[in-house]
């Protein structure tokens, strides 16, 4: 399986909400011995590998933001901790999973990573991640709403089909 990032760059005005999205692609084993753990964290563009470093999002760790279920099942963060920080992660039946950040500030600018861990019980774990940049702007040059820029590897039909997921 792979993780696709429909948008590689989100440019948003301060105070706006944004939903960053990743999509699970490829064959997904739906057997009882496989589950998927999905989460989000901030990182930096490392020289060797992007997303290798895990930093908190608004003081919440990837452990606090995770989703855990089998295959293409819907889920969302169940506790109030994330929502108190203006965050919510969610997943749908189509392999899309997202994190919504409310009331953006300049401090939210940076690199965000989604992580999927495929857990094959009693055997192994396989990790895949996706990366996207969030730029929060203020002043006269800031857009009035979030502007999203497609990833070069993403097909245009997917961008159009899922456009509504990313304008908030």
């Amino acid at each position: 399986f792979k993780v696709a990032t429909p948008y590689s760059l989100y440019v948003c005005p301060e105070g706006q909400n944004v939903t960053l999205t990743c999509r699970l692609l490829g064959p997904v084993d739906k057997g009882h011995d496989v589950t998927f753990y999905k989460t989000w964290y901030r990182s930096s563009r490392g020289e060797v590998q992007t997303c290798s470093e895990r930093r908190p999002i608004r003081n919440l760790t990837f452990q606090d933001l995770h989703l855990h279920h089998g295959g293409h099942q819907a889920a969302n963060t169940s506790h109030d901790l994330a929502q108190r920080h203006g965050l919510e992660s969610a997943s749908d039946h189509h392999g899309n999973f997202s994190i919504t950040m409310r009331n953006l500030t300049l401090l939210d600018s940076g690199l965000y990573c989604c992580l999927v861990v495929e857990i094959r019980h009693h055997h192994s774990e396989h990790r895949v991640h996706g990366a996207m940049e969030l730029q929060v702007q203020t002043g006269k040059d800031a857009p009035s709403n979030c502007v999203v820029y497609p990833s070069s590897s993403q097909e245009s039909e997917n961008i159009t089909a899922h456009h509504h997921h990313h304008h908030h």
Epitope: Q63, H66, V117, H121
Partner: antibody
Framework: QVQLVESGGGLVKPGGSLRLSCAAS????????MSWIRQAPGKGLEWVSE????????YYADSVKGRFTISRDNAKNSLYLQMNSLRAEDTAVYYC???????????WGRGTLVTVSS | EIVLTQSPATLSLSPGERATLSCRAS??????LAWYQQKPGQAPRLLIY???NRATGIPARFSASGSGTDFTLTISSLEPEDFAVYYC?????????FGQGTKVEIK
């Protein structure tokens, strides 16, 4: 910040039983995978068992399979290890630790000592 | 089961010296390897994750590298508080396994 505190250790005879507990502070315990790890006196670390946030799946080291049972009560923010048919080689400090998929043991309790001796 | 072999078993050094610890896996663990520090009477502490990333709050004098089967932890200049036992651990497969440890002692 979550803190972990183990209890329930003590002296037990070979063949006996003991139940260890790990109490977690913090509201997000139910989100975490948890493990038990032990360390025999003067020896290295040995992973014993792991339980997912929901209570299933569960994993055991071969050395304890069939004798130890891991469980959790998310409503009580507690992790347990039921140890039966104890042997001298089970003597160790037992630690509970947070253990997320694709991650490592980043949060540990201070441990509780289990001594199996006649 | 993946066996992790650490060397040397003991490293005798003076404060300010450089320490180089090795961990070798019996089969590839990709970059899914961590290093821990343990002081007497204390629980282990995560130092390094995914072979080369420092955990939160770990000083820059700790660095690590490697992938596959060969991994190295380096302490560039030993501080008095660095004298401890260091363990590597893999999570590429079940069961989770640790190396037997390297003790860094004061010379």
């Amino acid at each position: 910040q979550v803190q972990l505190v183990e209890s329930g250790g003590g002296l037990v005879k070979p063949g006996g039983s003991l139940r260890l507990s790990c109490a977690a502070s913090g509201e997000t315990f139910s989100d975490y995978y948890m493990s038990w790890i032990r360390q025999a006196p003067g020896k290295g670390l040995e992973w014993v068992s792991e339980i997912s946030n929901s209570g299933s799946p569960i994993y055991y080291a071969d050395s304890v399979k069939g004798r130890f049972t891991i469980s959790r009560d998310n409503a009580k923010n507690s992790l347990y290890l039921q140890m039966n048919s104890l042997r001298a080689e089970d003597t160790a400090v037992y630690y509970c630790a947070r253990d997320e998929p694709g991650w490592y043991f980043d949060l540990w309790g201070r441990g509780t000592l289990v001594t199996v001796s006649s | 089961e993946i066996v992790l072999t650490q060397s040397p078993a003991t490293l005798s050094l003076s404060p300010g010296e450089r320490a180089t610890l090795s961990c070798r896996a019996s089969q590839s663990v990709s970059s899914y390897l961590a290093w821990y520090q343990q002081k007497p009477g204390q629980a282990p502490r995560l130092l390094i994750y995914d072979a080369s990333n420092r955990a939160t709050g770990i000083p820059a004098r700790f660095s690590a590298s490697g992938s596959g089967t060969d991994f190295t932890l380096t302490i560039s200049s030993l501080e008095p508080e660095d004298f401890a036992v260091y363990y590597c651990q893999q999570r590429n497969n079940w069961p989770r396994t640790f190396g037997q440890g390297t003790k860094v002692e004061i010379k």
